[in-house]
């Protein structure tokens, strides 16, 4: 807590500029008007303040806005955002995507901090759903963002937002999350033709039911083994040998290398040996 002291003569700040870096903490407290700071927040980032000095500036803003900062200030926080606690951020009402981007930019290259997580949560809740532009922004900064959400949170993602999802955004999703995302993806991409559809839906297939896998086998997709290995075991088990053969196309030979791993192992055990023999791969049920 900085002690209340009078500002020395001639030191009263008329604007936020580089001269302030030479102010001691108590001088910043006494000589910088909080309202001036709020209107000139965009200048703060251009000035190499020390962490201690930033603490003082934050304190001044906290006093001016005890109920939470207005968005006009939040948008220009810059590195001062790193000083905010999740409790501070919970008081904010962030509605502009530009504000969100500006703050994420400050944290770029780092793990998602509790502050960032709180900010995103506030922003998404304020919007009511995870729209495409928001998802685009969040996954650009944090590719694992989508998979950090619970199935319940993912249920608020509208199908139109799925267009923003890249394959790498789903790398860490578990089956329960893909179960929620897959039907949205199917809806989002339903008007695409066969080959284009498969390219888009491929990374979501870990949530696909048996019927959809059977249907995919009718589209000459030639699914690779890496994708096949990520399918739900319960969805793969009812597939016939002919359907797997059609689904994988030339990649069917890769089943041999995966015969001891799920879901291939469990699928093999479910097939008649006569049927497996027709693949000519030496698979033993």
């Amino acid at each position: 807590e900085v002690e209340k002291t009078a500002c020395p003569s001639g030191k009263k700040a008329r604007e936020i500029d580089e001269s302030l870096i030479f102010y001691k903490k108590w001088e910043l407290e006494a000589c910088v008007d909080a309202a001036l700071l709020a209107t000139q927040m965009d200048r703060v980032n251009a000035i190499p303040f020390t962490y201690e000095q930033l603490d003082v500036l934050k304190h001044k803003l906290d006093e001016l806005y005890p109920q939470g900062y207005p968005e006009s200030v939040i948008q220009h926080l810059g590195y001062l955002f790193l000083k905010m606690s999740p409790e501070d951020i919970r008081k904010w009402n962030v509605t502009s995507l530009e504000t969100l981007k500006a703050l994420l930019e400050v944290n770029k290259g780092h793990e998602m901090s509790p502050q960032v997580a709180t900010l995103i949560d506030r922003f998404v809740k304020g919007r009511g759903q995870l729209d495409k532009d928001t998802l685009d922004t969040l996954t650009a900064f944090y590719p694992g963002y989508l998979c950090s959400l619970s199935p319940e949170e993912l249920s608020s993602v509208p199908p139109s937002s799925i267009w923003a999802v890249r394959p790498q955004d789903l790398d860490t999703c578990d089956p329960r999350q893909l179960d929620v995302l897959y039907p949205k993806a199917r809806l989002a991409f339903q008007n695409m033709n066969g080959s284009e559809y498969f390219v888009k839906i491929q990374s979501f297939l870990g949530g696909a039911p048996t019927e959809d896998l059977k249907a995919l086998s009718q589209q000459n997709v030639s699914m690779d083994l890496a994708t096949f290995m990520k399918l739900r075991t319960d969805a793969v088990l009812p597939l016939t040998v002919a359907e797997v053969q059609k689904l994988l196309g030339p990649h069917v030979e890769g089943l041999k290398a995966e015969e001891r791993h799920r879901p291939v192992r469990d699928w093999i055990l479910r097939q008649r040996q006569d049927d497996l023999d027709t693949l000519g791969l030496g698979l033993q049920g």
Epitope: E211, Q218, N220, T240, E243, Q245, K246
Partner: antibody
């Protein structure tokens, strides 16, 4: 043993409608796609429609698209073909067949549909 | 659509003869080629699928070969019950199409 038994064929006027049924037994009906294939008198085989195991997906050739509708009731182990706006060239024996990936592996005995005035 | 052309349209042969029927696809269908046998007044029956795999219960005198666009059905030693019409069918691409049929008659 897989058994497929078609019914519902008969004589119908051009422009008329008919619904064919196919009762399946001897296997788990809901595990397989099903199809209809027809054969005009003295002619070859023509695929008419396919439906996915749960009924979500349907496939048709251009010759019947918009006129024929394939459906199924898995609780009754029954496949259907609703044929509307029938034409003389739709006259054929209609077979229901189990469809496995790319193979029509089991066929019914067929039911004759005659479209004539 | 993929056109399937069988030849010959019909042939006459004797019991014990080796019979060969060919089927040509208008474009590459990989090995998704099936053969069916149909006797007069009866439903077709699957004989061979995926070019060369025998369906259950089909005698080993039937065999298939080929890939891409050209395929062959061979009956190594024709039996009285083999006199029928044979159809090829491609299962590579929708719409699935059949050849026009080859009728095998008694000489």
């Amino acid at each position: 043993e897989v058994q497929l038994v078609e019914s519902g064929g008969g004589l119908v006027q051009p422009g008329g409608s008919l619904r064919l049924s196919c009762a399946a037994s001897g296997y788990t009906f809901s595990d397989y796609f099903m199809s209809w294939v027809r054969q005009a008198p003295g002619k070859g085989l023509e695929w008419v429609a396919t439906i996915s195991n749960g009924g979500t997906y349907t496939y048709y050739p251009d010759s019947v698209k918009g006129r024929f509708t394939i459906s199924r009731d898995n609780s009754k182990n029954t496949l259907y073909l609703q044929m509307n706006s029938l034409r003389a060239e739709d006259t054929a024996v209609y077979y229901c067949a189990r469809f496995d990936g790319y193979i029509f592996d089991y066929w019914g005995q067929g039911t004759l549909v005659t479209v004539s005035s | 659509d993929i056109q399937m052309t069988q030849s010959p349209s019909s042939l006459s042969a004797s019991v014990g003869d080796r019979v060969t029927i060919t089927c040509r696809a208008s474009q590459d269908i990989s090995n998704y080629l099936n053969w069916y046998q149909q006797k007069p007044g009866k439903a077709p029956k699957l004989l061979i699928y995926y070019t060369s795999r025998l369906h259950s219960g089909v005698p080993s005198r039937f065999s298939g070969s080929g890939s891409g666009t050209d395929f062959t059905l061979t009956i190594s030693s024709l039996q009285p019950e083999d006199f029928a019409t044979y159809y090829c069918q491609q299962g590579n691409t929708l719409p699935y199409t059949f050849g026009q049929g080859t009728k095998v008659e008694i000489k």
